[in-house]
């Protein structure tokens, strides 16, 4: 969370941004809020990126002005135009690229004053893992798969019964480059699993942490997955 202040004569406004992460190839949002101003035509929003000449996006007089937009953002950005008057200057970013990572500035000018705040935008790839019972194996084993990760994550297994146990000797993890030659598919197999136990497959890099749980009993298999972005907010 970054709060910036600006001074215009006697007036300043508070601008707030949130560090966030973008998933390569998906659409993302760079969050920015400011003190609302009902005079839409008097609001100017400028998004800038460190090291880039030209603007990422500009919104003024109630509409976009992309005349100064840098080529790398062409056709990829939009503000939530109907939410500008209530203080939302967040930017939608289409088809997030690795090169979109960096420091962005959300600059606001209204009839009340002006202000700005910086935002650290991380880019990578992250996806939910899915665990299945691997019936092809000679012994009962579990297969944890997640289709898209970057940078290369670490993978660890845990179990409810054997808390604190190290499963690295009885698991095998591989990383397979996807067709776009950036992201990778993660596959990890855990061998010699026992029934009536809950196992967790944890995948983590510096952007996200994902966990897949599986409970195998005689009568059923229960699964649960969750994904958490790191250093956000």
């Amino acid at each position: 969370l970054i709060i910036g202040f600006g001074i215009s004569g006697k007036h300043f406004i508070t601008v707030t941004t949130f560090t966030s992460a973008g998933n390569i190839g998906e659409d993302g949002t760079l969050s920015c809020t400011f003190e609302p101003d009902i005079k839409l035509n008097g609001i100017v929003i400028q998004w800038l990126k460190e090291g880039i000449k030209g603007l990422v996006h500009e919104f003024k007089e109630g509409k976009d002005d992309l005349s100064q937009q840098h080529e790398m953002f062409r056709g990829r950005t939009a503000v939530f135009a109907d939410q500008v008057v209530v203080g939302n200057a967040s930017l939608r970013l289409k088809n997030v690229q690795l090169t979109d990572a960096g420091t962005y500035t959300c600059y606001i000018r209204t009839s009340k004053g002006k202000g700005n705040a910086n935002l650290e935008y991380k880019t990578g790839a992250f996806s939910m893992p899915e665990i299945n019972v691997d019936y092809n194996a000679s012994s009962e084993s579990l297969r944890c798969e997640a289709p898209r990760w970057f940078p290369q994550p670490t993978v660890a297994w845990a179990s409810q019964v054997d808390q604190g146990a190290n499963f690295s000797e009885v698991s095998n993890t591989s990383f397979e480059l996807n067709s776009e030659n950036v992201t990778m598919k993660v596959v990890s197999v855990l061998y010699n699993v026992t029934i009536n136990n809950t196992y967790s497959c944890m995948i983590e890099n510096d952007i996200a942490k994902a966990t897949g749980d599986i409970k195998v009993t005689d009568s059923e298999v229960k699964r649960r997955s969750q994904l958490q972005l790191l250093n956000s907010g």
């Epitope: 937009q69 056709g75 950005t77 939009a78 289409k94 088809n95």
Partner: antibody, heavy 120, light 107 residues
């Protein structure tokens, strides 16, 4: 409501330059949230996106045609234009102009289209 | 560039029946997909954008779904004016590309 109308020669000789103009009425070409695009459709075939332009003059072209395409804009006349050089019979198509959202990048509305035949 | 593949090439349906058209992208386009309708001698008309949002004035019988690489356009009850060619278009990355089209004809 916003309307677009293509105009230009219907017949162009091989190796020459195809030139078309799109006139926008019922709205300003200086609309901040839109690009202005060209799309073509060979007879009986599918659609091919050629490229677009912003009112400030910045352009993006389909790489497959980039070496031959020029799109320009005249805000005073509320028009934008397409030039395609060194044409061959394969460039025979109905050429459409359309308004393109800056994002989401839908195409709406479209002009009625104009058939350009490349033949000697 | 991203290749868009539509199926079937031709769909024969009786008036009042449901039509389901498919569009597949060669790589993920998230939800950055539009559908257009084209009648003979006319320009295409925008039906759906954002994979599932109906454009202004488009009847509720048209609906879009899907994300990533698999998309569907459904016409819940075909009217006589719906017989046409339908195209999908990705606007996820330049150059924007169209599918080859699906012709919906009267059975």
């Amino acid at each position: 409501q916003l309307q677009l109308q293509e105009s230009g020669p219907g017949l162009v000789k091989p190796s020459e330059t195809l030139s078309l103009t799109c006139t926008v009425s019922g709205g300003s070409i200086k609309s901040g949230s839109h690009y202005w695009g060209w799309i073509r459709q060979p007879p009986g075939k599918g659609l091919e996106w050629i490229g677009n332009i912003y009112y400030s003059g910045s352009t993006y072209y389909n790489p497959s045609l980039k070496s031959r395409v020029t799109i320009s804009v005249d805000t005073s006349k509320n028009q934008f234009s397409l030039k395609l050089s060194s044409v061959t019979a394969a460039d025979t198509a109905v050429y459409y102009c359309a308004r393109e959202g800056s994002y989401p990048n839908w195409l709406d509305p479209w002009g009625q289209g104009t058939l350009v035949t490349v033949s000697s | 560039e991203i290749v868009m593949t539509q199926s079937p090439a031709t769909l024969s349906v009786s008036p009042g029946e449901r039509a389901t058209l498919s569009c597949r992208a060669s790589q993920s386009v998230s939800s950055n997909l539009a559908w257009y309708q084209q009648k003979p001698g006319q320009a295409p008309r925008l039906l759906i954008y954002g994979a599932s949002t109906r454009a202004t004035g488009i009847p509720a019988r048209f609906s879009g779904s899907g994300s990533g690489t698999e998309f569907t356009l459904t016409i819940s009850s075909l009217q006589s004016e719906d017989f046409a060619v339908y195209y999908c278009q990705q606007y996820h990355s330049f150059p924007f590309t169209f599918g080859g089209g699906t012709k919906v004809e009267i059975k």
